[in-house]
């Protein structure tokens, strides 16, 4: 069975080329090894003066630490050095290279190829934890629609085998404190909080220990609150139409809705000479609407065949869900066979049938 | 609208490199990893490997640690796959797809790269 | 790797009818599975994920359950745009394997 990742591992005083920039380069080095990061200039031209930097803050020479313009050497390593170095132009700030370091407190021996997110004791790596995909730790706020599932990982490894546990904006966090529960997984060095809500907002710290030492890491996640809202339509739709007697129309609704939404195509009539009753409710007449076997896409489209004249008027697509109600209304034009088409006003078609 | 748009099909020789692209757009590019995704004729989908934008960092499917080399370009929010050394056995689509941030499945794909190795 | 064993390779199914897929894992995926729809010269489009979770936009006709090993997808009130390959995705680790596809045709 293949392994499935793959961590370049170092070994005494090796000089590791630069990566392209962009790239991040992880290396694995043995306590005690001498760590040697090399960055040619890109290119090959000038490179004009570098500053190398350690997480973040520039390294200062010493008898320990070496600093080139192109090369970086750190002696005697240990636990400590371990961390994300790169190499910047001073002026710009620009990362010209970038590596992610491991010490291990063994000397390094071999390929360190993790396959997934499980820790094994190898007997080689003993000492403290560290991250085995550090390429995934440094997205620090989530933010997630409420009732989605949400899972936060810290694969690590050490020697002895490290233990997880988490805490919520710094207390110890436990199944019991949320509703729905929690699903811990030591193995996958995952949280799991299925349906969250509002509540689960806040700060969640993995903390990554062994006897040799302990790390951790913090994600803040914010989740989402959908606005529940009524049904939008889509803007232009239903269209003014101009069409010929006895020709066919279409007349099309595009309804956007969380909610499962009800859509009715109706047309506006008149009664008694009047197009509105006593409290200016329009009159109209239901011409379409959900049945047993009627699909949503159905809906979304009135098909008038051989209009006459009598089908001329306003029609309106009416969209409705939990929260409300949205309407468009279009109007339809019949002109007699004989005569010529006229264009419709700007938003409108023409059909000849 | 979250778009990834990956460049044309190619056709290359046996032996030779390709490099395709996968331009994104709609979102914080270096907010999400890359995955890049195999389809063979007839075959599974297979990945092979993920980037991520921000750090530069990958993990590659050991199936394809030879073969593929990820990289991005955070200016332009584009993502790369090289390929090398190919042979008939290279010839698929390949997918990019971003990763969703908060559990891992793969939220939006482009629509492929058709690669044909031939001599 | 996790093995995802997708059934069946293809069907056939009548406008209107329901199909359901199935894909197991060779192993506890946690209900870290995800289904997809695949139509040619197009990108796969996401439509469920953590086994049942729909999509934002993907009707409620496309459905999903399962646990363990097990899951299934089902698509009820078959329209005729349904015509496309499905495929399961499993993300329970960081190794992610896909089941081998199911093409649906309409009768």
């Known amino acids: 069975e293949s392994l499935g990742t793959e961590q370049r591992v170092v070994g005494r005083a090796a000089e590791v080329p630069g990566p392209e920039p962009g790239q991040q380069e992880q290396l694995v080095f043995g306590s005690g090894d001498a760590v040697e990061l090399s960055c040619p200039p890109p290119g090959g031209g000038p490179m004009g003066p570098t500053v190398w930097v350690k997480d973040g803050t520039g390294l200062v020479p010493s008898e320990r630490v070496l600093v080139g313009p192109q090369r970086l050497q750190v002696l005697n390593a240990s636990h400590e050095d371990s961390g994300a170095y790169s190499c910047r132009q001073r002026l710009t700030q620009r990362v010209l290279c970038h590596f992610s370091v491991r010490v291990t407190d063994a000397p390094s021996s071999g390929d360190d190829e993790d396959g997934e997110d499980e820790a094994e004791d190898t007997g080689v790596d003993t000492g403290a934890p560290y991250w085995t995909r550090p390429e995934r730790m440094d997205k620090k706020l989530l933010a997630v629609p409420a009732a989605n599932t949400v899972r936060f990982r810290c694969p690590a490894a050490g020697n002895p085998t490290p233990s997880i546990s988490w805490l919520k904006n710094g207390r110890e966090f436990r199944g019991e404190h949320r509703i729905g529960g929690i699903k811990l997984r030591h193995q996958q060095w995952s949280l799991v909080m299925e349906s969250v809500v509002p509540s689960d907002r806040g700060n969640y710290t993995c903390v990554v220990e062994n006897k040799f030492g302990s790390i951790r890491q913090t994600y803040t996640l914010d989740v989402l609150e959908r606005s529940p809202h009524r049904p939008i339509l889509q803007a232009g739709l239903p269209a003014n139409q101009t069409a010929v007697l006895g020709s066919d129309v279409e007349f099309h609704c595009k309804v956007y809705s969380d909610a499962q939404p009800h859509i009715q195509w109706l047309k506006h009539v008149e009664v008694n000479g009047s197009k509105v009753g006593p409290d200016g409710t329009p009159y109209v007449t239901v011409l379409k609407t959900a049945g047993a076997n009627t699909t949503d896409k159905e809906l979304e489209v009135l098909s008038l065949h051989n209009v006459t004249f009598e089908d001329a008027g306003e029609y309106t697509c009416l969209a409705g869900n939990s929260i409300g109600f949205s309407h468009h209304s279009a109007w339809l034009v019949v002109l007699p066979a004989e005569e010529e088409l006229v264009e419709a006003d700007e938003a409108g078609s023409v059909y000849a049938g | 609208e979250v778009q990834l748009q990956q460049s044309g099909p190619e056709l290359v020789k046996p032996g030779a490199s390709v490099k395709m692209s996968c331009k994104a757009s709609?979102?914080?590019?270096?907010?999400?990893?890359m995955h890049w995704v195999k389809q063979s004729h007839g075959k599974s989908l297979q990945w092979i490997g993920y980037?991520?934008?921000?750090?530069?960092?990958?993990n590659y499917n050991q199936n394809f640690k030879d073969k593929a080399t990820l990289t991005v370009n955070k200016s332009s929010t584009t993502a790369y796959m090289e390929l090398r050394s190919l042979t008939s056995e290279d010839s698929a689509v390949y997918y990019c797809?971003?990763?969703?941030?908060?559990?891992?499945?793969?939220?939006?794909w482009g629509q492929g790269t058709s690669v044909t190795v031939s001599s | 790797d996790i093995q995802m064993t997708q059934s069946p390779s293809s069907l056939s199914a009548s406008l209107g009818g329901k199909v359901t897929i199935t894909c197991k894992a060779s192993?506890?995926?946690?209900?870290?599975i995800a289904w997809y729809q695949h139509k040619p010269g197009k990108g796969p489009r996401l439509l469920i994920h953590?086994?049942?979770t729909l999509q934002p936009g993907i009707p409620s006709r496309f459905s999903g359950s399962g646990s363990g090993r097990d899951y299934s997808f089902s698509i009820s009130n078959l329209e005729p745009e349904d015509i496309a390959t499905y495929f399961c995705?499993?993300?329970?680790?960081?190794?992610?394997?896909f089941g081998g596809g199911t093409k649906l045709e309409i009768k």
């Open positions: 797809a971003r990763e969703r941030d908060y559990d891992g499945s793969m939220d939006f």
């Open positions: 995705l499993q993300y329970d680790n960081l190794l992610w394997t």
């Open positions: 980037i991520n934008p921000n750090n530069g960092g990958t």
């Open positions: 953590y086994t049942s």
């Open positions: 709609g979102y914080t590019f270096t907010d999400y990893n």
């Open positions: 192993q506890d995926i946690n209900k870290f």
